[in-house]
């Protein structure tokens, strides 16, 4: 599930990783745009092994993956798109 959250909370990520995560290991991705209490964009990935990691938004692999997901957002996805807005 790909989520885009708009939230007034402070930054969620206390550390970020650039290590590649194969898509088959990913259960859900959450994107937190910058602003609204956090000065940077954050990307949170839930893995199928019940772990969770913040991914460096500058990591090439996550940028490529996000682009693929956006392009496929009108069709069935391995990681379906889910957008949710929080006031």
């Amino acid at each position: 599930v790909l989520e885009v959250y708009y939230t007034s909370l402070r930054c969620r990520c206390v550390q970020e990783s650039s290590v590649f995560i194969p898509r088959r290991f990913i259960d859900r991705i959450q994107i937190l745009p910058r602003g609204n209490g956090c000065p940077r964009k954050e990307i949170i990935v839930w893995k199928k092994n019940k772990s969770i990691v913040c991914v460096d938004p500058q990591a090439e692999w996550i940028q490529r993956m996000m682009e693929v997901l956006r392009k496929r957002s009108s069709s069935t996805l391995p990681v379906p798109v889910f957008k949710r807005k929080i006031p």
């Epitope: 206390v14 550390q15 990783s17 859900r28 019940k50 772990s51 969770i52």
Partner: antibody, heavy 122, light 107 residues
Framework: QVTLKESGPGILQPSQTLSLTCTFS??????????VGWIRQPSGKGLEWLAN???????YYNPSLQNRLTISKDTSNNQAFLKINNVDTADTATYYC??????????????WGQGVRVTVSS | DIQMTQSPSSMSASLGDRVTITCQAS??????LIWFQQKPGKSPRPMIY???NLANGVPSRFSGSRSGSDYSLTISSLESEDMADYHC?????????FGSGTKLEIK
């Protein structure tokens, strides 16, 4: 308000099966990212992680005890369970259940029950 | 399995002292470490998460640090209410493993 409370037999004999129940409120094990774990602590000693169960029924066990442990849940009644087969005196401990929520920042075992004391004695 | 070697197992310190407890990880855990405080007869409570971050409601005299595979919990000025057992937990990978615990007593 998140609360958890453990219940169990108090005392049992070697070779019996220990059955523990964790009854919780303030969260649901049907919610994405929610999990409950079991941890034990022999008197005056350190903590030992035993098992976790997650919202999707995914289960993780401590390999040193895996063949004796069974974790399960009853989502509708907000309960989690742990069974330990073939107990021995070394299983005498206080048993805790604790919540984990897969959110960032991830703090496993952020809420704990009060613990239940279990004694294995012949 | 990842082994967490915690030291000291017990220590006694005076009020106002600076106190440090250490856990050494047998493999890289990349800051996936929590420090719990457990007061006598009570359940553990998270104090520090991701090695260096203070949990909600924890006094600022507590801090966490890392040097290589060594993770430390420091109390800058010991108070009587800090008398407790302290446990580290690695959650980098299953099985989660705790250190053996440190009993902190007041002189």
């Amino acid at each position: 308000q998140v609360t958890l409370k453990e219940s169990g037999p108090g005392i049992l004999q070697p070779s019996q099966t220990l059955s523990l129940t964790c009854t919780f409120s303030g969260f649901s094990l049907s919610t994405y990212g929610m999990g409950v774990g079991w941890i034990r602590q022999p008197s005056g000693k350190g903590l030992e992680w035993l098992a976790n169960i997650w919202w999707d029924d995914d289960k993780y066990y401590n390999p040193s005890l895996q063949n004796r442990l069974t974790i399960s849940k009853d989502t509708s009644n907000n309960q989690a369970f742990l069974k330990i087969n073939n107990v021995d005196t070394a299983d005498t401990a206080t048993y805790y259940c604790a919540r984990s929520e897969l959110i960032m920042p991830y703090v496993p075992f952020d809420y704990w029950g009060q613990g239940v004391r279990v004694t294995v004695s012949s | 399995d990842i082994q967490m070697t915690q030291s000291p197992s017990s220590m006694s310190a005076s009020l106002g002292d600076r106190v440090t407890i250490t856990c050494q990880a047998s493999q890289d855990i990349d800051n996936h470490l929590i420090w719990f405080q457990q007061k006598p007869g009570k359940s553990p409570r998270p104090m520090i998460y991701y090695a260096t971050n203070l949990a909600n409601g924890v006094p600022s005299r507590f801090s966490g640090s890392r040097s290589g595979s060594d993770y430390s919990l420091t109390i800058s000025s010991l108070e009587s209410e800090d008398m407790a057992d302290y446990h580290c937990l690695q959650f980098k990978q299953y099985p989660f493993t705790f250190g053996s615990g440190t009993k902190l007593e007041i002189k």
